[in-house]
């Protein structure tokens, strides 16, 4: 058992150009607080995955009001450490997420509003009992400076808090085979009561006769290193030579209960009995109560009057997550018209419109023809945000400035010959065809298929297409 401790030294603008605007203003004073989430191992898990090693919220910092015209300074911080107790062995490798939250203290309806200012994450190796480790992390234009350490709670000692110490029975020395407990020289290492043969480096016990493995080790005596690469068959037998970790048949194999919870099999699954201060299906939730204000964005906290009972956040419309920290994706309803890009800014939806469109939802088609002229009698047509000219006969191009060759598209059917004419084109039809485009066959008896030839025109005469 032990405690992970986090000390925030400063939160403010990072070095370099583009200093962030102060998160608080005279109109909207605010204060900061922090949340830390710890997970065992060097896992690259999503921010939303459970904080299996535990989580903690800081107190609220002092109220801060920006001085007009002044650059954003380092912001005033909450007092004290963030402490995450762990009841189990300290894993040695861990992942962390540290979030900086802003509590706005303006005249919001329904109390203060919370918003996430910055989130930093990392993966570290850390031995329990060592000195404070210093770190600097950047999130956008913000910089967070902090220190952290893991320390064991007596009677536990060691880099994993797995060795136990007891007060000396004799004033001068420890019993046979037992060493003094550094740095507590007046105490002695307690006799190990683990299962016989349990690895002293990679195993530990909290009950007589048991042997529980540190992360990375497996086997009944914790002597087999876990390998993810050398297993030939994913469900083959476990062997001390390959060091393959094979899922056991029981639901409690590998103990799914975090934070020192004990697992018991049920007819259909498993059940975790959690230590004080933890709850959840796998004891993954640390003892935050409603008094800690865990619900963000105006969420209503229910239950959780003491650390042994779980709280539930009832989120206001538009927010979700166990702490109402996530916004629902409102852009999935595609409110922007005419191909506009939707941006959810939190307080409002914004649409970034394509060229030729404007308005809050890109609903206005801009008049592309304004100030544009189409030459040679052409008329301007709007559509799709693009300017287009409908050209008079004989002209083409974007602005109708080019003379068009009306015969270029070979408009005369059935081998008819095309002649350009000042008013358009004329088709000279091959024998047996007639019509403006030579599209109608002439029947052998002289009658045409459709329509009848106008009086005075014989089949085969050139026909002007007007």
């Amino acid at each position: 058992a032990g405690v992970f401790e986090l000390q925030i030294h400063s939160f403010g603008p990072g070095p370099g150009p583009g200093a962030p605007r102060s998160p608080c203003s005279a109109r909207l004073p605010c204060r900061l607080f922090f949340r830390v989430c710890l997970k065992p191992g060097l896992s690259e898990e999503a921010a939303e995955s459970p904080c299996a090693l535990g989580a903690a919220l800081s107190a609220r910092g002092p109220v801060y009001t920006e001085q007009p015209g002044a650059p954003a300074p380092d912001l005033p911080l909450p007092d004290g450490l963030l402490q995450v107790p762990f009841r189990d062995a300290w894993p040695g490798t861990f992942s962390f997420i540290i979030e900086t939250w802003r509590e706005e203290l303006g005249d919001q309806i329904g109390g203060p509003a919370w918003s996430l200012l910055a989130r930093v994450a990392g993966r570290r190796r850390l031995a329990a009992g060592g000195p404070w480790a210093r770190d600097i992390q950047r999130a956008g234009a913000w910089e967070l400076r902090f220190s952290y350490r893991a320390r064991c709670e007596p009677p536990a000692v060691g880099t994993a808090c797995t060795r136990l110490c007891r007060p000396r029975s004799a004033p001068s020395r420890c019993g046979p085979g037992l060493r003094p407990c550094a740095p507590l020289e007046d105490e002695c290492e307690a006799p190990l009561v683990c299962r016989a043969g349990c690895s002293p480096e990679h195993g530990f016990c909290e009950q007589p006769g048991e042997c529980r493995c540190l992360e990375g080790w497996t086997g009944p005596l914790c002597t087999v290193p876990v390998s993810t690469s050398s297993c030939l068959s994913p469900r083959g037998p476990s062997s001390a030579t390959t060091g393959c970790l094979v899922p056991g048949p029981g639901p409690c194999d590998g103990n799914p209960c975090a934070n020192g919870g004990s697992c018991s099999e049920t007819p259909r699954s498993f059940e975790c009995t959690c230590p004080r201060g933890f709850y959840g299906l796998r004891c993954e939730v640390s003892g935050v109560t409603c008094a800690d204000g865990p619900c963000f964005n105006g969420g209503l906290c229910v239950g959780g009057a003491d650390p042994d009972s779980a709280y539930i956040c009832h989120c206001p419309p538009g927010f979700q997550g166990s702490n109402c920290e996530k916004r629902v994706d409102r852009c999935s309803l595609q409110p922007c018209r005419n191909g506009g890009l939707c941006l959810d800014l939190g307080h409002a939806l914004r649409c970034r419109c394509r060229a030729g469109f404007a308005g809050p939802r890109c609903e206005h088609d801009l008049d592309d023809c304004a100030g544009r002229a189409c030459a040679n009698g052409g008329t301007c047509v709007e559509g799709g945000g693009a300017h287009r000219c409908s050209c008079a006969l004989g002209f083409g191009g974007r602005d109708c400035r080019e003379r068009a060759d009306p015969c270029a598209a070979r408009p005369c059917a059935h081998g008819g010959r095309c002649y350009a004419h000042f008013s358009g084109l004329v088709c000279a039809c091959a024998p047996g065809y007639m019509g403006a485009r030579c599209e109608f066959p002439v029947h052998p008896d002289g009658a045409s298929a459709l329509p009848a030839a106008p009086p005075g025109l014989r089949p085969g005469d050139p026909q002007r297409y007007l």
């Epitope: 538009g318 409102r330 309803l333 595609q334 409110p335 922007c336 506009g340 939806l349 809050p360 939802r361």
Partner: nanobody, 120 residues
Framework: EVQLVESGGGEVQPGGSLRLSCAAS????????MGWYRQAPGKQRELVAG???????IYAESVKGRFTISRDNAKNTVYLQMSSLRAEDTAVYYC??????????????WGQGTLVTVKP
């Protein structure tokens, strides 16, 4: 102020059908986009079906061919006909609307939700 009032939720057996309704009322000049989201326990809220700002109809992949969205513009109401319901459709169904108000501003509104439970 704008209100979205959902109705039609309830308990149904797998393979059964339900029809949800959502009526919008208040200082509405026009409805730009309107549809249905759902949120199952412990899951993210997700879009089920909707009418976009361009009046296109969109559906989540998991409900295509089973759910149909329709609307009555005169009543500012949208409907979700749910057929061949499965256990995984169990969720709270929320109506959502992007509305242009009399002030010409646009605002996004949510209903309070209606519970749909699919169990044998």
């Amino acid at each position: 102020e704008v209100q979205l009032v959902e109705s039609g939720g309830g308990e149904v057996q797998p393979g059964g059908s339900l029809r949800l309704s959502c009526a919008a009322s208040g200082s509405i000049l026009s409805i730009n986009a309107m549809g249905w989201y759902r949120q199952a326990p412990g899951k993210q809220r997700e879009l089920v079906a909707g009418f976009t700002g361009d009046t296109n109809t969109i559906y989540a992949e998991s409900v295509k061919g089973r759910f149909t969205i329709s609307r009555d513009n005169a009543k500012n109401t949208v409907y979700l006909q749910m057929s061949s319901l499965r256990a995984e459709d169990t969720a709270v169904y929320y109506c959502a609307a992007d509305v242009q108000l009399f002030s010409r501003d646009y605002e996004f509104y949510w209903g309070q939700g209606t519970l749909v439970t699919v169990k044998p």
